[in-house]
């Protein structure tokens, strides 16, 4: 960066090299060049010469003033015009940054995804700070009082093996940067209460051509948790609103859920589960598409491919169509 150059003088910023965005700032340049009484001192921002708001303070020093500085980063350097020198002589340079102090971290959430071996903690960091902001996640045992701290710049994965102070903990997040420090409220957790079951996945769908055609959705999870509650939501792709069905589930076998749907319509399905009575849900599974047949039997091997016909089946339509979900954030 600009700060690594050899200097023939000194450049400094008031109030500081990192300051609150929107502040008025002054950049001072003091020349210390042998055999040079500078005729003029020049300031450059990101390589472009500044023309205005420059004040000569004395023979060797000048000040550049900025009102309401809004750039997150800038490289500043200053030069001197020395008598008998054809080119400007570099005095010194400095990288400057503007931004905001951190907001109080809120919505601190810690979950253990089954089989992951980690407790994952996330939070809402608030507004963008524009400057380097670090987060310290504090995990304190309610049983032993031992506290672990984890330094990160976003979320944190903490090995459950390192949580040796029993099952009950307090978790809080401290945010700090050059402009300030804030701290979240303390979240009380019990490790057994924050486990999210292994992901539920819809594997296929079939519509059985009976007097009233019915669609069966096949879905499963590798969870070892005994009591699991699930929700399946579905809608016609042309609709905005979801229909939701709730299930108390035992994953010792593949689940089959029955739906009576309109013919010749493309539907989308998603499923999510939680340990019964606990706080956190899985994110919704990836989107699963299934087109119900017209009254004529129809088989679909992929929801995105053309329809294929198979007239000798009681099964009117089979789908295995997935699309990765983009709304995976519903764990609260």
């Amino acid at each position: 960066g600009i700060t690594n150059i050899n200097c023939s003088g000194h450049i400094w910023v008031e109030p500081a090299t990192i300051f609150k965005m929107g502040m008025n700032i002054s950049i001072y340049c003091q020349a210390a060049i042998k055999n040079c009484q500078p005729r003029k001192l020049h300031f450059y921002k990101n390589g472009i010469k500044e023309r205005f708001q420059i004040t000569r303070i004395n023979k060797t020093t000048a000040r550049l003033w900025y009102k309401n500085f809004l750039e997150p980063h800038a490289s500043m350097y200053c030069t001197a015009e020395c008598p008998k020198h054809f080119q400007e002589t570099l005095i010194c340079g400095k990288d400057i940054s503007s931004g905001y102090p951190p907001d109080i971290p809120d919505e601190v959430t810690c979950v253990i995804y089954e089989y992951s071996g980690n407790m994952t903690c996330t939070w809402n960091a608030g507004k963008l700070t524009y400057i380097d902001t670090k987060y310290v996640v504090h995990v304190k045992s309610l049983e032993t009082e031992e506290e672990q701290q984890y330094l990160t710049s976003s979320y944190i994965n903490i090995s459950t093996d390192s949580l040796q102070g029993g099952k009950k903990y307090l978790v809080w997040v401290q945010a700090a940067n050059a402009l300030g420090m804030e701290e979240s409220k303390q979240l009380q957790i019990h490790l057994d209460d924050i486990v999210i079951p292994s992901a539920a996945v819809i594997s296929r769908a079939e519509t059985i051509n009976a007097t009233v055609p019915k669609t069966i959705i096949y879905w499963d999870s590798q969870t070892t948790i005994e009591k699991v509650s699930c929700e399946m939501r579905y809608k016609a792709t042309t609709n905005q609103t979801w229909n939701v069905k709730e299930f108390d589930t035992n994953f010792t076998y593949v689940q089959q859920s029955e739906f009576y749907l309109e013919p010749n319509i493309k539907y989308v399905f998603q499923v999510r589960c939680q340990e019964t009575g606990k706080r956190y849900w899985q994110p919704w599974s990836s989107l699963f598409f299934h087109k119900t047949p017209e009254t004529v039997p129809q088989v679909t091997s992929k929801a995105f491919q053309h329809d294929t016909w198979n007239s000798g089946l009681t099964v009117a339509s089979i789908s295995t169509g997935h699309l990765t979900s983009d709304n995976r954030g519903d764990i609260g």
Partner: antibody
Framework: EVQLVQSGAEVKKPGESLKISCKGS?????????MCWVRQMPGKGLEWMGC?????????YYANWAKGQVTISADKSISTAYLQWSSLKASDTAMYYC????????????WGQGTLVTVSS | DIQMTQSPSSLSASVGDRVTITCQAS??????LAWYQQKPGKAPKLLIY???KLAAGVPSRFSGSGSGTDFTLTISSLQPEDFATYYC??????????????FGQGTKVEIK
Amino acid sequence: EVQLVQSGAEVKKPGESLKISCKGSGIDFNSNYYMCWVRQMPGKGLEWMGCIYVGSHVNTYYANWAKGQVTISADKSISTAYLQWSSLKASDTAMYYCATSGSSVLYFKFWGQGTLVTVSS
Amino acid sequence: DIQMTQSPSSLSASVGDRVTITCQASENIYSFLAWYQQKPGKAPKLLIYSASKLAAGVPSRFSGSGSGTDFTLTISSLQPEDFATYYCQQTNRYSNPDIYNVFGQGTKVEIK
């Protein structure tokens, strides 16, 4: 058994700088631990000044009245914590204790013998 | 900022008396509270941690109770060596930038 040995008493003039130390033995310096400083002015109660957390990273915490007045640091390699002033005032005259449990709890099983700092012109 | 309010600030008692000192936190500190004894010219000594756990080597006449915001130190039968000043200390968290002091103001137990 953890032992904390503090540097000796100091007599200073206002405006002078000072760094006092607290050497720990028996602490597992590869584990996470808090080392804290407590002030006791003559005839007064205990006042928490701040702590340094030493673990995979180092973090310092200060009482709001001590922020900017003192600096807490530690040298893990020699198991020593420090409390320093850049410009002493007469009101800094007090007994200063370092304290720890040798772990990452905030109650103090172990205390140094105290360092008496006298600031007088 | 968590404030610790200790009462009484002083009390007079006789050997054999049951003595109770209270400490109130301005917000929930769970069971994160310690009690110390300090004698003149000496460093404080840990008596109780986690609100009710007796520190090593502390006589069983000392006991602590409470959680949340209200805590008590009890000396069941005061002994001559117990005349001293007692302090409570919140041990929840020190990372909050607004903390002024983590100790109570102290309770001086004097001979009646």
